[in-house]
Amino acid sequence: FPQDRPFEDTCHGNPSHYYDKAVRRCCYRCPMGLFPTQQCPQRPTDCRKQCEPDYYLDEADRCTACVTCSRDDLVEKTPCAWNSSRVCECRPGMFCSTSAVNSCARCFFHSVCPAGMIVKFPGTAQKNTVCEPASPGVSPACASPENCKEPSSGTIPQAKPTPVSPATSSASTMPVRGGTRLAQEAASKLTRAPDSPSSVGRPSSDPGLSPTQPCPEGSGDCRKQCEPDYYLDEAGRCTACVSCSRDDLVEKTPCAWNSSRTCECRPGMICATSATNSCARCVPYPICAAETVTKPQDMAEKDTTFEAPPLGTQPDCNPTPENGEAPASTSPTQSLLVDSQASKTLPIPTSAPVALSSTGKPVLDAG
């Protein structure tokens, strides 16, 4: 194509551009350390930093870890991309009761409508099953005020979702998608220092580097990538996502390429001292099932929530953590709410896995 020749020649004398024969045009040459976001960049803004696998480039041009969907109740909805985080959602048959950035902090099984009720809307990854009376005007038989409450006007009662047993971070028992080999390896390799948090095996299906666009010698088909478990912060630096490996924490949102993982206290615990993207100290929630009162809320969105009477009004409650230390005053944003799972969960001062027996009492699982 002789007509392309003059255009090609104009690139030769310009060190900031090169000629791409495939697209037959002049392309902007990205500076060292930056890589094109498209085949033929036209301007400096078409060049980006290269993050490590499992990191994405956030709005502030920082490599930030993509969230992980390795928890057993999560599945990947969208993959980790160079400029957006992986997105996780609750696996089929479950819905998200506590949302998190690009993920779900807590999934519950979809409710089964109780006797006298039928499904109005089937459960999704975001919402629980919505039930309605089988015959209009007939109210459902409420076995106890804990399982059923008078609906607010315009809301429809739901059956209680079945909570997932709270998993502790035990390498040998944590369900690992993609095989158990690594979990067993991790269990044998990880040595815990005294009083340090336990560690968790990583799914063997994700050995460390997610595939990236090939980067031929001398070309710039790379994007800024941080190492796994790092995200690109606002300053364009790869920064470690917080880890939720402490026994009293659960992952609220996964590590994304441009945002940190966030952690929250596990069910049955409340945050006494907050920390960036996490909680520095979780304390056991007082357990007074007989004293709880129901708090009305939009039943179509969430499960029944129980509100504990103010601390100090419960004769059989001990809000003091296991170590005997009095809890710090809770942050103003932390409401004293116990969900239906928390009311069944006792804090156990070990790293042994916890299961709930049919009586609702915790059972230590030896593995």
């Epitope: 340090s196 948090p197 990583r202 050995p207 580097l209 190492e227 920064t239 880890s243």
Partner: antibody, heavy 123, light 106 residues
Framework: QVQLVQSGSELKKPGASVKVSCKAS????????IHWVRQPPGKGLEWIGY????????DYNQNFQGRVTITADKSTSTAYMELSSLRSEDTAVYYC????????????????WGQGTTVTVSS | IELTQSPSFLSASVGDRVTVTCKAS??????VAWFQQKPGKAPKVLIY???YRESGVPDRFTGSGSGTDFTLTISSLQPEDFAEYFC?????????FGGGTKVEIK
């Protein structure tokens, strides 16, 4: 087991370039990034940069930007670190390193190190 | 992120309890590792994530701290522990190391 074997000592003149190799074995080379760290005599450690052998993409400490090039040859499972425009303060032991391969989180602390390559820059 | 290690040098006897500190110029969470290095050898990881002991590391080595202040403690110094110790932050790139603490025989 994981092993990182580096090339031998180098004596270079100021202004010259040096290319140090790091041959990996005992694991799938393209699965983990290879990092380079240096240690001047009697001093601390300084991170230089890393390469993703799978994609060929690299990232460098800005202190070395423009002078360092990290590459990888998948066929031989070898990473290379080339430092140009050498000066006397580049005299150091250069290490290649790899992060650990277990745990739920893949943070970059180094569990595996090469034996080190001494680079001396002297006129 | 700068890491300031102290002391830079200490003399101790076998059986002593030794404490090395590492202060970060900004919050690094628990993203700190501790290394031991003997002359002419590559560093060897002792502690990662501030308090996790690497497999095979004796339990006399303990790591603690979070945020900006970290400590490596050797509860009862053994002859093989005389070496140089470095902290590393891996919270933010570029990765940085402390200046080192040389533990020598008194």
């Amino acid at each position: 087991q994981v092993q990182l074997v580096q090339s031998g000592s180098e004596l270079k003149k100021p202004g010259a370039s040096v290319k140090v190799s790091c041959k990996a074995s005992g694991y799938t080379f393209t699965t983990y990034t290879i990092h380079w760290v240096r240690q001047p005599p009697g001093k601390g450690l300084e991170w230089i940069g890393y390469i993703n052998p799978s994609s060929g993409c690299s990232d460098y400490n800005q202190n070395f930007q423009g002078r360092v090039t990290i590459t990888a040859d998948k066929s031989t499972s070898t990473a290379y670190m080339e430092l140009s425009s050498l000066r006397s303060e580049d005299t150091a032991v250069y290490y290649c390193a790899r992060r650990a391969d277990y745990g739920n989180y893949e943070y970059t602390w180094f569990a595996y190190w090469g034996q080190g390559t001494t680079v001396t820059v002297s006129s | 992120i700068e890491l300031t290690q102290s002391p830079s040098f200490l003399s101790a006897s076998v059986g002593d309890r030794v404490t090395v500190t590492c202060k970060a110029s900004q919050n690094v969470g628990t993203n700190v590792a501790w290394f031991q290095q003997k002359p002419g050898k590559a560093p060897k990881v002792l502690i990662y994530s501030a308090s996790y002991r690497e497999s095979g590391v004796p339990d006399r080595f303990t790591g603690s701290g979070s945020g900006t202040d970290f400590t490596l403690t050797i509860s009862s110094l053994q002859p093989e522990d005389f070496a140089e110790y470095f902290c590393q932050q891996y919270h933010t790139y570029p990765l940085t190391f402390g200046g080192g603490t040389k533990v020598e025989i008194k």
